[in-house]
């Protein structure tokens, strides 16, 4: 039994990985930031007269609130500017765009690439580094919901122009230290992390130095999760891989969920020569399926002695009673021919089904469960 409709013998899975455009864009800004909301006309057609509304009330333009037909700017944002913003057709009140804006007591959140903190020629002959925007560095705690983008900034100057580096919890912090990577915008003196997860919590220190001196600033990041929440997949995992015929491959998927998630490894397959069914949704087969009892699951799919048949598109999917998260990834197999034999570590291999109709199965996955190797699933139950 599943959370979907009754399972057919052969079925298809609807694409969940590429969600349709969100009806409400979630935006997080730091106190003091400029909030910029853009609402282009649908389909590029004429917009007609519009009105911007916050929490149900029309916005009154001011020196701080700049209102245009397709764009809204709120300068020097504060807590009071948090809320639900929408752009509506003036006559019909039809909502064209909808934004949820949250302004945090924090340096910044989100990658707005505003360029306003770019390095500048100070005109000073020589000098140790100094902060150019210290008023924007007062708030040292940034608390953002999981899956948001976070940006820390340390706008500085000096002569010669100082360098900037970043530490996490006192240790050098580089892109490879974080799944999903980081963006270092040296011109903006910023560190950007997309799709933050609980493991990103910690103290982030910018170190700005030149030959005349060094300054540093530490920010604390807390990643907030509502309980319960739908599963979150760590950004960047699983990663696409290329393998040589006959080699062994391992994929990683890191799942965060405080409500027992049903985790599945799936592979897109062909049925009667077709990759999709009559309704256009792709066929998949279940390679592995189990319930995780822990909040953080670092799960693995191992494919041994891969053959050309193992190449293709796979999915890591996590589902709980709130919702679904999934990530598609690819395996490319090439090179000298090896044995055609393939060994897939799978418990439901060959079971092709209507994936969205078997999104989660508390009932199926209950009852008899055997604990498989700790090395493989880190104490996750195997169905």
């Amino acid at each position: 039994e599943s959370l979907g409709t009754e399972q057919r013998v052969v079925g298809r899975v609807a694409e969940v990985s590429g969600p349709e455009p969100s009806q409400q864009e979630q935006l997080v800004f730091g106190s003091g930031d400029a909030v910029e909301l853009s609402c282009p006309p649908p389909g590029g057609g004429p917009m007609g007269p519009t009105v911007w509304v916050k929490d149900g009330a029309g916005l009154v333009p001011s020196e701080r609130v700049l209102v245009g037909p397709q764009r809204l700017q709120v300068l020097n944002a504060s807590h009071e500017d948090s809320g639900a913003y929408s752009c509506r057709q003036r006559l019909t009140q039809l909502v064209l765009c909808h934004f949820s804006v949250r302004v945090t007591d924090a340096p910044s959140s989100g990658d707005d690439e505003d360029g306003e903190d770019e390095a500048e020629d100070t005109g000073v002959d020589t000098g140790a580094p100094y902060w150019t925007r210290p008023e924007r560095m007062d708030k040292k705690l940034l608390a953002v919901p999981a899956a948001n983008t976070v940006r820390f900034r340390c706008p500085a100057a000096g002569n010669p122009t100082p360098s900037i580096s970043w530490l996490k919890n006192g240790k050098e912090f580089r892109g490879e230290h974080r799944i999903g990577g980081i963006k270092l915008r040296h011109q903006q003196w910023s560190l950007v992390m997309e799709s933050v997860v609980p493991s990103d919590r910690g103290n982030y220190t910018c170190v700005v130095e030149n030959k005349f001196g060094s300054i540093r600033q530490t920010y604390t990041l807390d990643v907030l999760e509502r309980s319960p929440h739908r599963p979150i997949l760590q950004a960047g995992l699983p990663a696409n891989q290329t393998a040589v015929l006959g080699s062994d491959v391992e994929f990683h998927c890191k799942v965060y969920s405080d409500a027992q998630p049903h985790i599945q490894w799936l592979k897109h397959v062909e049925v009667n020569g077709s990759k999709v069914g009559p309704d256009g949704t792709p066929y998949v087969t279940v390679l592995k399926s189990w319930i995780s009892e822990s909040v953080e699951a670092d799960v693995r799919l191992r494919l041994a002695n891969v053959s050309e048949r193992d190449g293709g598109e796979y999915l890591c999917r996590a589902t709980n009673f709130i919702g679904v998260a999934e990530k598609a990834f690819w395996l490319s197999v090439h090179g000298p021919r090896a044995a055609e034999e393939e060994l897939v570590e799978a418990d439901e291999a060959g079971s092709v089904y209507a994936g969205e109709q078997k999104l989660i199965s508390e009932e199926d996955l209950g009852g008899e469960q055997k604990l498989i190797s700790e090395e493989d699933l880190h104490h996750h139950h195997h169905h």
Partner: antibody, heavy 115, light 108 residues
């Protein structure tokens, strides 16, 4: 903050179809499960069914032959249709987020089945 | 379907006391798929506990859940005046997902 709002007629005649719509605000309807639950006059809670944003559904077997739940992601709405109603279907109907257990509820709408 | 039986039907206690509400299921529930809700008059139920023991966001820590298999308990360590309402348990391990009949907590 996610908010759900039920809408639809409060009075339905016996043998007709009860139709309710739930509008979700504060978050996208995508990637979540959405449920209908009702509370009968005796305060008993009954799960009616749920739908995923892709359109897949699951219903309470006791109501399955009469229930249809649909979703319109472009409007951030999902709907309930219950056919061939009788007085026993008189209840407060809630829409909620979640497939089984639910974390956000609408305020509920009373539907009375009477001629 | 799985039948949930809550006891007692009504529990009379005083503010400051400890409340223990019981929920028994007719079949064992896998993986602790049990939730507790609080319902105030004229309002929708509110999720308190899920996964048998996990507190939902915003729920005071005086509320705790425990149990496994067929026997589950909601404990309110120190009753506040606003806690004297109705509580429901729900199993979501097997369809149809069913609720208990409720326990009414009243001021003695």
């Amino acid at each position: 903050q996610v908010q759900l709002q039920e809408s639809g007629p409060g009075l339905v005649k016996p043998s007709e179809t009860l139709s309710l719509t739930c509008t979700v605000s504060g978050d996208s309807i995508n990637s979540y499960f959405w449920s209908w639950i009702r509370q009968l006059p005796g305060k008993e809670l009954e799960w009616i069914g749920h739908i995923y944003s892709s359109g897949s559904t699951r219903y309470n077997p006791s109501l399955q032959s009469r229930v249809t739940i649909s979703i319109d992601t472009s409007k951030n709405q999902f709907s309930l249709k219950l056919s061939s109603v009788t007085a026993a279907d008189t209840a407060v109907y809630y829409c909620a987020r979640g497939a089984s257990a639910v974390d956000y509820w609408g305020q509920g709408t009373l539907v009375t089945v009477s001629s | 379907e799985i039948v949930l039986t809550q006891s007692p039907g009504t529990l009379s206690l005083s503010p400051g006391e400890r409340a223990t509400l019981s929920c028994r299921t007719s079949q064992s529930i896998s993986s602790g798929y049990l939730a507790w809700y609080q319902q105030k008059p004229g309002q929708a139920p509110r999720l308190l506990i899920y996964g048998a023991s996990r507190r939902a966001t915003g729920i005071p820590d005086r509320f705790s859940g425990s149990g496994s298999g067929t026997d589950f308990t909601l404990t309110i360590s120190r009753l506040e005046p606003e806690d004297f309402v109705v509580y429901y348990c729900q199993q979501y391990g097997s369809s149809p997902y069913t609720f208990g009949q409720g326990t009414k907590l009243e001021i003695k």
